[in-house]
């Protein structure tokens, strides 16, 4: 069966029907490049005016305007608010009332696209494997990133969160139109990774999405992550304004000027440093969501009532912090270089500024306890990675899970740890799952490109797709069309249950209290320490152009690893997606 032309609120669209075998039978309808909104520079997105005739939705549209890997040029375009749909079909009748999974990509709110990195037309976020294996509709889309998506003056002149509003427009478009593609508008799951996972979290917290979202999955990121909310947007807006020659004293005049500035110039006016700075790299993520009093009306911690009826899966990779550790403490990845106590203390200080000297010392002490017994470089490097993983991913995720569970009415809560080790041959032997390593498995790459993977990788991919799509169907990862290797029990506040995802998932994979000692430290010991400098997120760099963090470095700085350009290698590389 195949859909043919589908009538949407914008007009007719026609995709392509791809047969899944030479013998006919099952197939997938694929629609690429359906417009869901339009947007002017630094303005909220608006409804797309539509078209006449039948839109041929057969090619991915360009990503939203963003800096290239070298940060000295741009690619993509401003006209970028398009979405893509995969609809699995059986042999006889067209699909009807299928669960819908809407993907939000990561990339530090700075880069990325709905189709993901691409190698020889093999796109990372190709929804075909999820759709056909789980019998769900998959939707991916573009949203604005970088200054164009998140620049804010912290007031009504430039409220920011444009990229979040793009995401909302896509979700709302799906709600209104997906029935025509065979989807169930009352069963929408949003899922995402890293900045996309934090976006998923923020969308569930925003009052704008009331009634739109049934379930959510956050992979390595939360609204509570220290890198997910910008507490000092005006500083960064002024930084950009200065670079492009806009006035900075009056936010109204600054906003008016920025809106008519060449969007490419705005994009290139910000550069993310990768060489070691005074503070950890996440402090330099300037253009990220803000508490605008509207789309995000309050601090995310106060918005969990809005998730009371949204089923949630949240988890992290066991070495999510590795990518950041390699930037903040470059010796971590280098066999011939050593990590010193001083390196680690500087890193700890950078992440604990709000609590001053006491905070840094207490944190340093608990994390280095094992160093007395095992002062090996391997142990010290693993500690650096564990610390970054905890601060940036584990602790915010655990707090979010507890908040979700505590505020739940009908909602169910599930937690996981992804531990299937990275396949990067250049990584140390002790390496676990790096940031973004989970993506290839969720998107079924071991099946789509089997020669690049081992049977154990396919086992991981099969299990993840089964759990994820069962959850989208029923709200329970164990119940649905796909058999699962073991029962995944819900998260409870008492036991902190989580599923450890590895190549062999058994009943022993259900575990409890992940890194309980460290969670207690952050939630209790660290929390009660007196705050010495106000909120650590409001650290304001000096107003001059000096290189003191977190002022963005000058234009000749190095750059952080970013996703490959559209014709480069795909997901198995480290830092393919950034964070």
């Amino acid at each position: 069966a195949k859909l043919g032309a589908v009538y949407t609120e914008g007009g007719f669209v026609e995709g392509v029907n791809k047969k899944l075998s030479l013998l006919g039978g099952d197939s997938v309808d694929i629609f690429k490049g359906i417009p869901f909104a339009t947007a002017k520079t630094l303005e909220n997105p608006q409804r797309h005016p539509g078209w006449q005739g039948t839109l041929k939705a057969t090619n991915f549209k360009k990503r939203c305007l963003q800096a290239t890997i070298t940060q000295d040029n741009t690619y993509g375009q401003e006209d970028c608010l398009y979405l893509n749909i995969w609809v699995p079909q059986g042999r006889k009748q067209v699909s009807h009332n299928l669960p819908v999974m809407v993907w939000i990509y990561g990339g530090a709110f700075l880069m990325g696209s709905g189709q993901g990195a691409n190698f020889l037309k093999n796109y990372l976020y190709d929804g075909e494997e999820i759709a056909t294996r789980g019998n769900v509709i998959v939707v991916t889309f573009n949203y604005r990133v970088g200054p164009l998506g998140f620049l804010s003056t912290g007031d009504a002149n430039l409220p920011g969160n444009f990229g979040l509003r793009d995401q909302h427009m896509a979700i709302a478009w799906v709600k209104r139109n997906i029935a025509a593609f065979g989807g169930d508008p009352d069963n929408i799951t949003i899922f995402g990774e890293s900045a996309g996972a934090a976006s998923v979290s923020l969308q569930t917290l925003s009052p704008y999405n009331k009634g739109l979202i049934r379930r959510a999955i956050s992979q390595s990121g939360m609204a509570l992550s220290p890198w997910a909310i910008q507490k000092n947007p005006l500083f960064w807006a002024k930084t950009i304004a200065k670079k492009v020659g806009c006035p900075t004293e009056d936010t109204g005049k600054m906003a008016a000027c920025l809106k008519i500035t060449d969007p490419r110039a705005l994009t290139l006016a910000y550069k993310l440093p990768v060489k070691k700075q005074e503070y950890p790299v996440v402090h330099y993520l300037a253009f990220i969501p803000v508490i605008d009093g509207d789309f995000i009306p309050d601090d995310p911690i106060n918005l969990y009532n809005n998730t009371a009826d949204i089923d949630y899966i949240a988890g992290i990779n066991n070495m999510d912090g590795h990518l950041f550790a390699t930037i903040d403490v470059p010796a971590v990845d280098k066999t011939k270089q050593t990590v010193t106590e001083e390196d680690f203390y500087r890193l700890v200080s950078g992440h604990t500024v709000a609590k001053g000297l006491k905070g840094a010392q207490a944190t340093f002490d608990i994390y280095t306890e094992s160093w007395a017994q095992d002062p090996s470089q391997e142990n010290m490097k693993k500690t650096v990675v564990a610390f970054e993983t905890d601060v940036l991913f584990l602790i915010p995720t655990e707090i979010a899970l507890a908040q979700h569970k505590a505020h739940a009415k009908s909602a169910k809560t599930y937690s996981y740890l992804f531990s299937h080790p990275s396949r990067m041959p250049i990584y140390p032997k002790w390496m676990g799952a790096d940031h973004a390593d989970d993506l290839q498995y969720v998107f079924g790459k071991p099946f789509a490109t089997p020669l690049g993977y081992r049977p154990q990788d396919r086992a991981v991919s099969k299990a993840m797709i089964a759990y994820w799509t069962n959850f989208a169907r029923s709200g329970d990862p164990n119940m649905g069309n796909s058999p699962v290797p073991t029962h995944w029990y819900p998260y409870t506040l008492e036991n902190g249950n989580y599923l450890d995802i590895t190549k062999t998932i058994t009943s022993a994979s259900m575990k409890e209290h992940l890194r309980e000692k460290f969670l207690k430290f952050w939630a209790v010991t660290f929390e009660v320490l007196p705050t010495v400098t106000g909120d650590q997120d409001t650290l304001t760099p000096p107003e001059d152009d000096s290189e003191v963090a977190p002022d963005p470095p000058s234009d000749d700085s190095q750059v952080v690893p970013v996703p490959p350009t559209d014709d480069s290698v795909e997901a198995q590389m480290p830092a393919t997606i950034g964070f």
Partner: antibody, heavy 119, light 105 residues
Amino acid sequence: QVQLVQSGAEVKKPGASVKVSCKASGYTFTSYNMHWVRQAPGQGLEWMGVINPSDGATSYAQKFQGRVTMTRDTSTSTVYMELSSLRSEDTAVYYCARDYYGSSPLGYWGQGTLVTVSS
Amino acid sequence: DIQMTQSPSSLSASVGDRVTITCSASQSISYLNWYQQKPGKAPKLLIYAASRLPSGVPSRFSGSGSGTDFTLTISSLQPEDFATYYCHQRSSYPTFGQGTKLEIK
């Protein structure tokens, strides 16, 4: 100027089919979608479906699926709406209506065709 | 399908009055349109995209709203304005409100 001229009134028996035509003029026929909307006596408006005259693509309201067929003849700039298995509750005025612009409202309407279903 | 609910379903008013008709959608919609229909005639487009007037529609008609709640206002009723008014949402399955009949008091 845009004109949509519909065929005359019809009286049909239950179980029969009716085919209503709508001839367009004053614009490029293949450039705009054509919708069919009906209105039972003393009742409100009900959307039945839409056809894209350039390629013949159609979409029908769930309620009429399997009973309605919309076609077009580009040589005469005419669209047709055929409704089968008629029942008394199909007695209504049937309107063709052209999109105003983009995915916009129904900007131009035919004069309507009364279809009476009676035994 | 998205349900559209108009209120009131009928309304009596006098020439010169200011009249407001509301339309509520069962879920958030992108844009809303309003039509005027006189007995024995086809509907006529009055307002589109919630607040925009097609050429030839008098400026006494105005529309507002977004999300789920929309309003049609006639600032000063004229004799030719007595008719039935319908709201309409354009999604993949368009639907109309049940209509509001505006009668002379």
